[in-house]
């Protein structure tokens, strides 16, 4: 048995931040689980982890330098990524693992979400002030 995951096909991070919601065909509230977000077609980079246990507070962390937070819904985990760079535009995959009670469960690989990071377009300040009027 595999858990199904739904993600938005594409998200645009206008202010270098984005909310990515991973929706599962599974209620996580009474489970010990590990939800994670992975970057790249090969899911090589683990961007963020949300660890939950029904009796304790959520633990959210990144071991790869991403600024992330996470929120738990009944059948979803939302990852909030901030301070993204334009070169972090990529496809991101949600993963879910149910650790306890047994048996261990994980998900069918989802289609992923392309996060397109658009840098802040600030008007550049002139190098030299223009000629002053008399």
């Amino acid at each position: 048995n595999k858990i199904l995951v739904k993600q938005s096909p594409m998200l645009v991070a206008y202010d270098n931040a984005v909310n990515l919601s991973c929706k599962y065909s599974y209620n996580l509230f009474s489970r010990e689980f590990r939800a994670s977000l992975h970057k790249g077609l090969d899911s090589a980079v683990e961007v963020c982890v949300v660890y939950g246990n029904y009796s304790q507070q959520l633990q959210v962390y990144s071991k790869t330098g991403f600024n992330c937070d996470g929120k738990l819904g009944n059948e979803s985990v939302t990852f909030y990524l901030q301070n993204l760079y334009v070169n972090q535009t990529d496809i991101y995959f949600c993963k879910i693992e149910v650790m306890y009670p047994p048996p261990y469960l994980d998900n069918e690989k989802s289609n992923g979400t392309i996060i397109h990071v658009k840098g802040k377009h600030l008007c550049p300040s002139p190098l030299f002030p223009g000629p002053s009027k008399p």
Epitope: N1, Y26, N27, F29, S30, Y54, P101, P103
Partner: antibody, heavy 120, light 107 residues
Framework: VQLQQSGAELKKPGASVKVSCKAS????????IHWIKLRSGQGLEWIGW????????QYNAQFKGKATLTADKSSSTVYMELTGLTPEDSAVYFC??????????????WGQGTLVTVSA | DIQMTQSPSSLSASVGDRVTITCKTN??????LAWYQQKDGKSPQLLIY???HLVEGVPSRFSGSGSGTQYSLTISSLQPEDFGNYYC?????????FGGGTKLEIK
């Protein structure tokens, strides 16, 4: 799915008894088996569960030291041994399979029950 | 441990009556609750899981409701075969305690 329990037992106080629950019709190592006690004129009491896939066990604190859960994978059987029997252990004992309904648990399959009578 | 308070402990009703049994918990169990029917000498039968979901094959006169700490089992129109004992059980951590039971008798 079938859970076939061993037959009725008559035991003396202080003795031990081992009740069996033979599973069939599914992959034995993929499901938790719960044990439940029903005393005459009283309600259901949860004893604990056993997961044959990894031998994980959870006991109700009230039954620790009283009940011991084990399994034999080769025969797809879960056992519950009760030690130091007293008349209060006289009851019908059920095994039941836990199913996971997309993250919500319940016990849809039950054995027929085993009557244990403790009498001098 | 979670405490399960089931009421009433016994109930006399007639065929055709609408009957409601309640189960209260001392903390939120997030709908991780099941209801069972048990007849004398028989194994319990699962009626409802996840507080509101009817098990396939169980008559539609049975329904479950509630959330948080308060849950109910309702039989909309009692039939002769509905008499027996009813139990709730939670699955929010362990122990997976049962309610004290409700004995439903013919009036």
């Amino acid at each position: 799915v079938q859970l076939q329990q061993s037959g009725a037992e008559l035991k003396k106080p202080g003795a031990s008894v081992k009740v069996s629950c033979k599973a069939s019709g599914y992959t034995f190592t993929e499901y938790i088996i719960h044990w439940i006690k029903l005393r005459s004129g009283q309600g259901l009491e949860w004893i604990g569960w056993f997961y044959p896939g990894s031998n994980d066990i959870q006991y109700n604190a009230q039954f620790k030291g009283k009940a011991t859960l084990t399994a034999d994978k080769s025969s797809s059987t879960v056992y519950m041994e009760l030690t130091g029997l007293t008349p209060e252990d006289s009851a019908v004992y059920f095994c039941a399979r836990r199913d996971d309904f997309s993250g919500y648990d319940a016990l849809p399959y039950w054995g027929q029950g085993t009557l244990v009578t403790v009498s001098a | 441990d979670i405490q399960m308070t089931q009421s009433p402990s016994s109930l006399s009703a007639s065929v055709g009556d609408r009957v409601t049994i309640t189960c209260k918990t001392n903390e939120n169990i997030y709908s991780n609750l099941a209801w069972y029917q048990q007849k004398d000498g028989k194994s319990p039968q699962l009626l409802i899981y996840a507080a509101t979901h009817l098990v396939e094959g169980v008559p539609s006169r049975f329904s479950g409701s509630g959330s948080g700490t308060q849950y109910s089992l309702t039989i909309s129109s009692l039939q002769p075969e509905d008499f027996g004992n009813y139990y709730c059980q939670h699955f929010w951590g362990t122990p997976n305690t049962f309610g004290g039971g409700t004995k439903l008798e013919i009036k």
